[in-house]
Interface confidence: low
């Protein structure tokens, strides 16, 4: 059998095979050792018994999408049946004090591979044995502690495979410089040690995407905005836009990144090198927000100039830095293999990312202030609680509810929260009466809200002792 017979039905075209060379990967035309690594089809009854105590689940994730030229990292995590875990020696053991469906196991081991690997018969003087090999016959790398690595992972994509010895989780990074743009499929098959052979325990696949567009996300935040995810914001208050570029392999770390904003409200283009920007909309309505991100990224080099005439001496090839746009016809897409063969060249290419959103601007509560606090006189006998009136003003739209959160002086430990509807006139002046249990210092958070906004103010308040012999102290601020 060949690797492609074992690892999946996706058969890339000859062009794809030629142009998607992954560094360190091998062609899936190679032979697969079926004696050491048996191959089971889906639905084969042997899968049922491939693992003691249940099925192992493999979870494959990647940090896709990847900007072409950057590294994409794939991670595989094995999830064992309940109550099983891998110990420090790479053996699979039952968790202590963890009861599974079969009850507590007297034997702490699900698989005790250490005992087997210490019995190293069949090895020659180099410490290499005929069974410590990958499916293509390559020997296992002898890293320190390699005997504790009891899982064999075979990654397969674009007509190539990569083999890795590991524990219950592994990571593999692939450079995407030679990968065709668009969605691609990664498949992983996992084997475990079984005596002097291996048994398949899990198969998993996941789609990853390689793109020439910078993956861009924008978060939007505005003080007093009630729901930051609904793309509805308030008039006359700044919105903070924060651009997040998905670049997990730090491919653009040394790139100058430019951000070109159009806020859709006839304020013109705004160009910046800062990933955050503030903008205030002064009119209600619906606006189209557009962002273009531009970065000079490492990229394929354009074809070299024709060689000089023989009569002239050949110039030395110094390292050069060239730059051109990714939408320039020709070099970027023509023949990436040819382009990357120029020695000692370090070329750059402008990459772009785009973000568009429709945002709605509405009236909202812009500000809230406590202008007066009054201790309400209580009749005798003196109760243990105090009543305090807060006189509050606001600006902007008219609130429909008021909430007070009373907490300790650090404003961290909430003692009580009260919310109630309010009916406020155009002047936006209201009185909020709240009860305080006992004397002391309190933190009071007061919020006024309507459908779209929530404005907050805070104050520290000192409630005096209730001493019948002394007059009540009125607290104003």
């Amino acid at each position: 059998k060949r690797f492609h017979d074992v690892l999946g039905n996706e058969r890339p075209s000859a062009y794809m095979r030629e142009h998607n060379q992954l560094n360190g990967w091998s062609s899936d035309e190679n032979d697969w050792n079926e004696k050491l690594y048996p191959v089971w089809k889906r639905g084969d009854m042997r899968w049922k018994n491939s693992w003691k105590g249940g099925r192992v689940q493999a979870v494959l994730t990647s940090d896709s999408p990847a900007l072409v030229g950057s590294n994409i990292t794939f991670a595989v995590n094995l999830i064992f049946p309940r109550c099983q875990k891998e110990d420090a020696n790479g053996n699979i053991v039952y968790e202590k004090n963890c009861r599974n469906e079969a009850g507590l196991s007297a034997d702490p081991y699900v698989y005790n591979w250490t005992a087997w690997s210490e019995d190293s018969d069949g090895e020659n003087g180099t410490g290499q044995s005929h069974h410590n090999v990958f499916p293509d016959g390559k020997p296992f790398p002898h890293h320190p502690g390699w005997r504790r690595w009891n899982f064999i992972y075979v990654f397969h994509t674009l007509g190539q495979y990569f083999q890795k010895l590991g524990r219950c989780s592994v990571r593999v990074s692939v450079n995407t410089a030679n990968v065709t743009l668009g969605p691609q499929l990664m498949e992983v098959t996992v084997y475990r040690r079984h005596g002097r052979a291996y048994v398949p325990i899990a198969q998993v696949k996941d789609v990853y995407v390689v793109t020439d567009q910078i993956p861009v996300f924008v978060t939007m935040f505005q003080k007093n905005d009630r729901n930051s995810s609904d793309e509805t914001f308030l008039k006359d208050l700044p919105i903070m836009f924060d651009v997040l570029i998905h670049d997990p392999s730090h491919f653009l770390n040394y790139s100058t990144i430019n951000y070109k904003w159009s806020f859709g409200d006839n304020t013109g283009l705004f160009v910046s090198t800062n990933h955050t920007v503030n903008h205030t909309y002064v009119l209600n309505g619906t606006f189209s927000l557009n962002l273009t991100v531009k970065a000079a990224a490492p990229g394929p080099c354009p074809p070299p100039p024709p060689p000089p005439r023989p009569s002239k001496p050949t110039p030395s090839l110094a390292t050069t830095l060239k730059s051109y746009d990714s939408n320039t016809p020709g070099p970027a897409g023509d023949n990436p293999l040819e382009l990357s063969r120029i020695p000692d060249e370090n070329c750059q290419i402008n990459r772009y990312g785009h973000f568009q959103a429709t945002i709605t601007i509405v009236e909202g509560i812009l500000e809230v202030n406590i202008i007066q606090m009054t201790d309400v006189l209580m009749p005798v006998p003196w109760p243990e609680s105090s009543l305090i009136d807060f006189v509050v003003t606001c600006q902007g739209s008219i609130p429909t509810e008021v909430c007070t959160i009373i907490s300790d002086p650090t404003c961290e430990i909430t003692q009580n929260t009260v919310c109630s509807p309010v009916d406020v006139d155009e002047m936006c002046l209201l009185t909020v009466r709240r009860t305080f249990n006992g004397s002391g210092t309190y933190c009071v958070n007061l919020t006024l809200g309507d459908d779209t906004s929530l404005a907050l103010t805070s104050t520290l308040i000192s409630v005096p002792d209730r001493d019948p012999a002394s007059p009540l102290r009125m607290a104003n601020s």
Epitope: R82, D87, A88, K96, N97, C98, R99
Partner: antibody, heavy 114, light 107 residues
């Protein structure tokens, strides 16, 4: 977003009982072992009890064995700690956490004093 | 029961410095060790899991290492927000046990 919200704390006299509850949201509650951890005022953290996924396995620190009962209701995504025969040394903030403290609630105060 | 001995109990260091906190288990805990940060009045937060795994969202200046019985938390380039108490927890077997804590003060 994972949320764990404890309730049921308060002040009681020694020998009395309290029942703490923890409401979970934002994750598949039945997939997780759950744990109660406590912290006496200005002191360190102390594991109290844990329970496995389906409630069939419960584990307690020696000083609370026979007095405290940990339980769960997976249908309601809730964790409970029934505390009987309370002692002054049980005073502290009680936190509900997933297994070994991956996510934590905000804590609830229990005061035991005469 | 597994005892976790954490040292030092307190630590004072300047901004930008590098500090280490140690936890010693009374027996092999097979990397089942978690480090937490706790600020006054707040719940603990996971920094490092499985001895060396950096929890999502935790700055890379935090790192964990160790195996067997001995583990350490290292903070490179201290920042003012790192002032807190740090705890280790062994999750190898019941009863789960915490270290006694290290209070880190920024000078």
């Amino acid at each position: 977003e994972v949320q764990l919200v404890e309730s049921g704390g308060g002040s009681v006299r020694p020998g009395r009982s309290l029942k703490l509850s923890c409401a979970a949201a934002g994750f598949t509650f039945s997939d997780y072992y759950m744990t109660w951890v406590r912290q006496a005022p200005t002191k360190g953290l102390e594991w109290v009890a844990s329970i496995n996924h389906d409630g069939g396995g419960t584990y307690y620190r020696d000083s609370v064995k026979g007095r405290f009962t940990i339980s769960r209701d997976n249908a309601r995504s809730s964790l409970y700690l029934q505390m009987d025969s309370l002692r002054s040394e049980d005073t502290g903030t009680y936190y509900c956490t997933t297994r070994a403290g991956w996510h934590w609630g905000q804590g609830v105060m229990v005061t035991v004093s005469s | 029961d597994i005892q976790m001995t954490q040292s030092p109990a307190s630590l004072s260091a300047s901004l930008g410095e590098t500090v280490s906190i140690e936890c010693l288990a009374s027996e092999d805990i097979y990397n089942y060790l978690t480090w937490y940060q706790q600020k006054p009045g707040k719940s603990p937060q996971v920094l490092i899991y499985s001895a060396s795994g950096l929890q999502d969202g935790v700055p890379s200046r935090f790192s964990g290492s160790g195996s067997g019985r001995q583990y350490s938390l290292k903070i490179n380039g201290l920042e003012s927000e790192d002032a807190a108490t740090y705890f280790c927890l062994q999750d190898s077997e019941y009863p789960l046990t915490f270290g006694s804590g290290t209070k880190l003060e920024i000078k």
